[in-house]
C-alpha cells in the first residue's frame, strides 16, 4: 500500500482542517488508514483522524482543531496499521479556505432596490471576522447569459443594487462566497442559493 498523491490540507481557520490524498489503488480508508496530527506545542498530544473514502482510491479526513492562531504548525503522520506511509506538516494559516457565508436573503420590499444580506460565517472573536470580503453571483434561471458577479470589498455583509439593473418579470437566483486577503485564502464554497421574482415599476417614458 502506497500514497500516490500526498495529503494536502486546508483550514477553515476556526475548528476544522480538511486533508485529502490518493492511494495507489482502491482503499477502504476508514478501516485501513489513520491520520495522526499533533500541534507543535510543548506537552501537546497526538489526535487521530479516521478518514473517509472520497472516490475509489481517494481519502479525506476532517481534523478537529481547538481554534487556530497564525503560529500554529501541525505534524501529520499517515499510518496503515504499524506502517508509516507518509510524514508531513501543515500550517493552517498558510492554507485557509474560509467557511461559506450563510442565511442569504433578498429583500425586495425596498422601493426599486434589491437588498441582499447574508451572515458572516465567523464569530466576532475570530481573526477572519473582520477580514472577509465577498463575491455575490446573480443569474437568471431563464437566460444563462444573464450572469453577473458583484465584488463586495467592504466589511458589511450586504449588497444593494437597483432592481432595474436586472430584467423585470423573471426569476433570479443569488449566491455568495467569501475570501480573506490577509491570509491570501482561496475562495470559500458558494452559499446555498436563494431565489426571487424580480419585478419593478418601469419608469414612464417622457415624450
Amino acid at each position: 500500500m502506497k500514497v500516490l498523491q500526498e495529503p494536502t490540507c486546508v483550514s477553515d481557520y476556526m475548528s476544522i482542517s480538511t486533508c485529502e490524498w490518493k492511494m495507489n489503488g482502491p482503499t477502504n480508508c476508514s478501516t485501513e488508514l489513520r491520520l495522526l496530527y499533533q500541534l507543535v506545542f510543548l506537552l501537546s498530544e497526538a489526535h487521530t483522524c479516521i478518514p473517509e473514502n472520497n472516490g475509489g482510491a481517494g481519502c479525506v479526513c476532517h481534523l478537529l482543531m481547538d481554534d487556530v492562531v497564525s503560529a500554529d504548525n501541525y505534524t501529520l503522520d499517515l499510518w496503515a496499521g504499524q506502517q508509516l506511509l507518509w510524514k508531513g506538516s501543515f500550517k493552517p494559516s498558510e492554507h485557509v479556505k474560509p467557511r461559506a457565508p450563510g442565511n442569504l436573503t433578498v429583500h425586495t420590499n425596498v422601493s426599486d432596490t434589491l437588498l441582499l444580506t447574508w451572515s458572516n460565517p465567523y464569530p466576532p472573536d475570530n481573526y477572519l471576522y473582520n477580514h472577509l470580503t465577498y463575491a455575490v453571483n446573480i443569474w437568471s434561471e431563464n437566460d444563462p447569459a444573464d450572469f453577473r458577479i458583484y465584488n463586495v470589498t467592504y466589511l458589511e455583509p450586504s449588497l444593494r443594487i437597483a432592481a432595474s439593473t436586472l430584467k423585470s418579470g423573471i426569476s433570479y437566483r443569488a449566491r455568495v462566497r467569501a475570501w480573506a486577503q490577509c491570509y491570501n485564502t482561496t475562495w470559500s464554497e458558494w452559499s446555498p442559493s436563494t431565489k426571487w421574482h424580480n419585478s419593478y415599476r418601469e419608469p414612464f417614458e417622457q415624450h
Epitope: F41, L42, D67, A71
Partner: antibody, heavy 120, light 108 residues
C-alpha cells in the same frame, strides 16, 4: 467556580524533600496540560515543570531536571510535584497552573500558591 | 535557550495615559506563542493576552497585544488606577516555556 488549591509547602533543610499537591475543582483536570511555576521572594516568575493531559509527556526546566518529578492523578483531580535534593535557590512560592490548548500556552487559571522555604 | 528581556524595567505614568510595554525575544519565534500576565502584590498572576494578540476572557479592551518574530508589545490604551502592577511576557514554544523578568508599571 474553577479553582486550583496548592498544599504541601513548608520549611525544609537543604538536601531534603517535599511533595506539593494541587487539587482542582470546577473543571476536569484530565482535559488540560498542567504546570508548576515558581516565584522567589521579590523576583519574577520562573517556569518549573509541566505534564500533558494524559501524562504521556512531561517537561522540566534545566534548573530542576533530575531533582523534581511531576505527576497527576486524573480520577482524583490532583497534580503533584515531588521535590528532592532541595537547594536554597528553590525557595519560592510555587503556583499550580492550568494551560488551555485554546489559549496556546496562556496560563488561564492559577492557584494561590504554596510557599517552600529551603534553609538550615 | 530563548531569553525574553522586557523594557522598560519600570514605567512611571499617570492614570488616563497610554502605556507601551516591550518584550524582545533573543531569537525568532514563528512557531511559539506569546502571552502577557498582570501581577499585583500578594496575588497570583492573571492572564491578559494569549497568542500574541488575543484577549483572555474578561479582560477589558483597553489591553491589546501585538508583534511578531522577536518584538512584542503590550499596550494599555488608557490607564485605570487598577492597572498599576507588574507585567510579565511569556513565550510558550514547542520545547520550552520562558518568562520575561517583568515590567513594573507605577503611578507617577
Amino acid at each position: 467556580e474553577v479553582q486550583l488549591l496548592e498544599s504541601g509547602g513548608g520549611l525544609v533543610q537543604p538536601g531534603g524533600s517535599l511533595r506539593l499537591s494541587c487539587a482542582a475543582s470546577g473543571f476536569t483536570l484530565s482535559s488540560y496540560a498542567m504546570h508548576w511555576v515558581r516565584q522567589a521572594p521579590g523576583k519574577g516568575l520562573e517556569y518549573v515543570s509541566g505534564i500533558s493531559y494524559s501524562s504521556a509527556s512531561t517537561y522540566y526546566a534545566n534548573s530542576v531536571k533530575g531533582r523534581f518529578t511531576i505527576s497527576r492523578d486524573n480520577p482524583k483531580n490532583t497534580l503533584f510535584l515531588q521535590m528532592s535534593s532541595l537547594r536554597a535557590e528553590d525557595t519560592a512560592v510555587y503556583y499550580c497552573v492550568r494551560v488551555k490548548v485554546r489559549y496556546r500556552g496562556g496560563m488561564d487559571v492559577w492557584g494561590q500558591g504554596t510557599t517552600v522555604t529551603v534553609s538550615s | 535557550e530563548i531569553v525574553l528581556p522586557q523594557s522598560p524595567g519600570t514605567l512611571s505614568l499617570s492614570p488616563g495615559e497610554r502605556a507601551t510595554l516591550s518584550c524582545r525575544a533573543s531569537q525568532g519565534v514563528s512557531s511559539a506563542y506569546l502571552a502577557w500576565y498582570q501581577q499585583k502584590p500578594g496575588q497570583a498572576p492573571r492572564l491578559l493576552i494569549y497568542g500574541t494578540s488575543r484577549r483572555a476572557t474578561g479582560i477589558p479592551d483597553r489591553f491589546s497585544g501585538s508583534g511578531s518574530g522577536t518584538d512584542f508589545t503590550l499596550t494599555i490604551s488608557r490607564l485605570e488606577p487598577e492597572d498599576f502592577a507588574v507585567y510579565y511576557c511569556q513565550l510558550y514554544g514547542s520545547t520550552s516555556v520562558t518568562f520575561g523578568q517583568g515590567t513594573k508599571l507605577e503611578i507617577k
